[in-house]
């Protein structure tokens, strides 16, 4: 057998289909690997050949296109199952060749089972709906090409286990499911079952997607920096550890990139000759608003470091903001003496010092101190 350009096993296209349902699988060669389409290849005299390797076997075997009722067939660059069986699971290869040219790619096909609630190992697409945004729709996905436009299928929608019928804010409208107003309670899995006739037989297509209700663009704001802020002063003695958290709230925005970064004296920390570490944590609200915290840490701060400018920056599709942290070198508290002569001044100084000590002892995560005036 002469050389063939082998693109290997394309695991990016892990195809999952439901048992006992039709499946149409396009040869990935024309979609992702070659610069020409099937029609061009066919008119140039190239032939498309299909074969497969069963699950847990190494032996490549031809696909049987002579099964009763043409259960498996090929049409142009599409491999058809009408319908699938559980033991169709395996790695499928499509090979394009003539006497001088050969190119092939394999891909995994997994036939999966579902229950009456449409639970299965199927990886589900996620559709985001804006909270309290007015009427929004989801559409039954991946049903194109299964039946001609002259065929009018019946479509039944389900929420989890339950048929959506006379629901008071979710309305099935053919291939669409309309949410009159979306709330957090609408989060979950929604399934459309498309039933259509073909050659005296009835087929079903099951498509499940996850609905996630997210923050509305109506409520979106530019990033909000909660820390650093004007109420907190980071007062340190040389040799102590300086920890400054930058905590930023981002409204959910579809396809927005949220960024947080620190500058020290107007430069990125990497460009400054001091030992700075930055740790980031991210949390999300139920509507996917995001809170990012970047903690800037200098293990042993110098008096020089305490004179620098530390600025937290944040950017989203809604805008860019920045906030400087107030960093100071701690002045040792004056000793209290009887000759103080300053009324209660000395007592106040001790009280202030005690308060700072208490704050430190009180488990303030990032060692920041409230500055009392």
């Amino acid at each position: 057998s002469e050389r063939c350009d082998d693109w290997g096993l394309d695991t990016m296209r892990q195809i999952q289909v439901f048992e006992d349902e039709p499946a149409r699988i396009k040869c990935p060669l024309f979609e992702h690997f070659l610069k020409f389409n099937y029609s061009t290849a066919h008119s140039a005299g190239l032939t498309l050949i299909w074969y497969w390797t069963r699950q847990d076997r190494d032996l490549e075997e031809p696909i049987n296109f002579r099964l009763p009722e043409n259960r498996i067939s090929k049409e142009k660059d599409v491999l058809w199952f009408r319908p699938t069986l559980l033991n169709d699971t395996g790695n499928y290869t499509c090979m394009l060749r003539n006497t001088t040219y050969c190119s092939k790619v394999a891909f995994p096909l997994e036939v999966v089972q579902k229950d009456s609630c449409f639970n299965s190992p199927m990886k589900l697409p996620v559709h985001k709906l804006y909270i309290e945004y007015g009427i929004q729709r989801i559409t039954c996905p991946n049903v194109d090409g299964y039946f001609p436009s002259s065929v009018k299928p019946t479509i039944t929608w389900y929420m989890g286990c339950y048929k959506i019928q006379n629901f008071n804010n979710v309305i099935p409208e053919g291939m669409n499911l309309s949410f009159l107003i979306a709330f957090i309670s609408n989060n979950g899995n929604y399934t459309c079952v498309v039933t259509y006739p073909e050659n005296g037989r009835t087929f079903h297509l099951t498509r499940t997607l996850t609905v996630k209700v997210v923050g509305s663009p109506k409520n979106a704001v530019p990033p909000v920096i909660h820390s650093p802020n004007d109420h907190v002063v980071y007062e340190k003695e040389p040799g102590e550890e300086l920890l400054i958290p930058c905590t930023v709230y981002f409204s959910f925005l579809m396809d927005s990139r949220n960024e947080v970064w620190w500058t020290i004296d107007g430069k990125k920390p990497d460009d400054i000759p001091i030992d700075v570490t930055i740790n980031e944590s991210i949390s999300h609200s139920r509507t996917e608003d995001e809170t990012r915290t970047q903690i800037l840490s200098i293990k042993k701060v110098t008096s020089e470091d305490l004179k620098r400018s530390y600025v937290c920056h944040a950017r989203s599709a809604k805008g860019e903001v920045a906030k400087a942290a107030t960093v100071k070198q701690k002045v040792p508290a004056p000793r209290y003496t009887v000759e103080g002569g300053g009324g209660t001044g000395g007592l106040n100084d001790i009280f202030e010092a005690q308060k700072i000590e208490w704050h430190e002892g009180g488990g303030h995560h990032h060692h920041h101190h409230h500055h009392h005036h």
């Epitope: 019928q165 006379n166 309670s185």
Partner: antibody
Amino acid sequence: QVQLVQSGAEVKKPGSSVKVSCKASGGVFSYYAFHWVRQAPGQGLEWMGGIIPGYGATFYAQKFQGRVTITADESTSTAYMELSSLRSEDTAVYYCARPVSYSSGWYDYWGQGTLVTVSS
Amino acid sequence: EIVMTQSPATLSVSPGERATLSCRASQSVSSNLAWYQQKPGQAPRLLIYGASTRATGIPARFSGSGSGTEFTLTISSLQSEDFAVYYCQQYNNWPWTFGQGTKVEIK
């Protein structure tokens, strides 16, 4: 934690109706499915139907269609099952039960049961 | 509808012994099967779902196996509190259906 508390035992005449209640606590009542399952003396369990209160959506087993009505009062977090045209074979313990989510086909939580006796 | 058949109807076992209960579906229900325990005068209690996953708080002596049409609930070493009626339930197809139950009694 989740609790389902049902109304007390009932004795009914053939041809009449019975309405059993199930008061839920723990979790957001409106957005869970509440099912009714019955058990005749010495028999197995039989699914009758269910409701998702927040959607006003009801589901019935074909066998009981037209004879059973499942409702809910969101203000009191209570689901109800009314069975009409009672006959002696409807004598059973009626349970309300709740799956953990819309996508679960099993019952994590059950009421204590309500005995309905149909006798002339 | 799918008919669930449990066997035996009654199982007599001594405490400390193993009990094996069987449940058969009239057609394949994949792994979409749950087991419940019911004691006299009480509501059923979920033991197993997904044919083999123990529910929260269920002791390890309870285990489920099987898929398709044949399922088994095994109690590895019967305790006095395990003497009860056990039901299987399929949720592969609507309507969800239960078996008639197996009574596990003290031998």
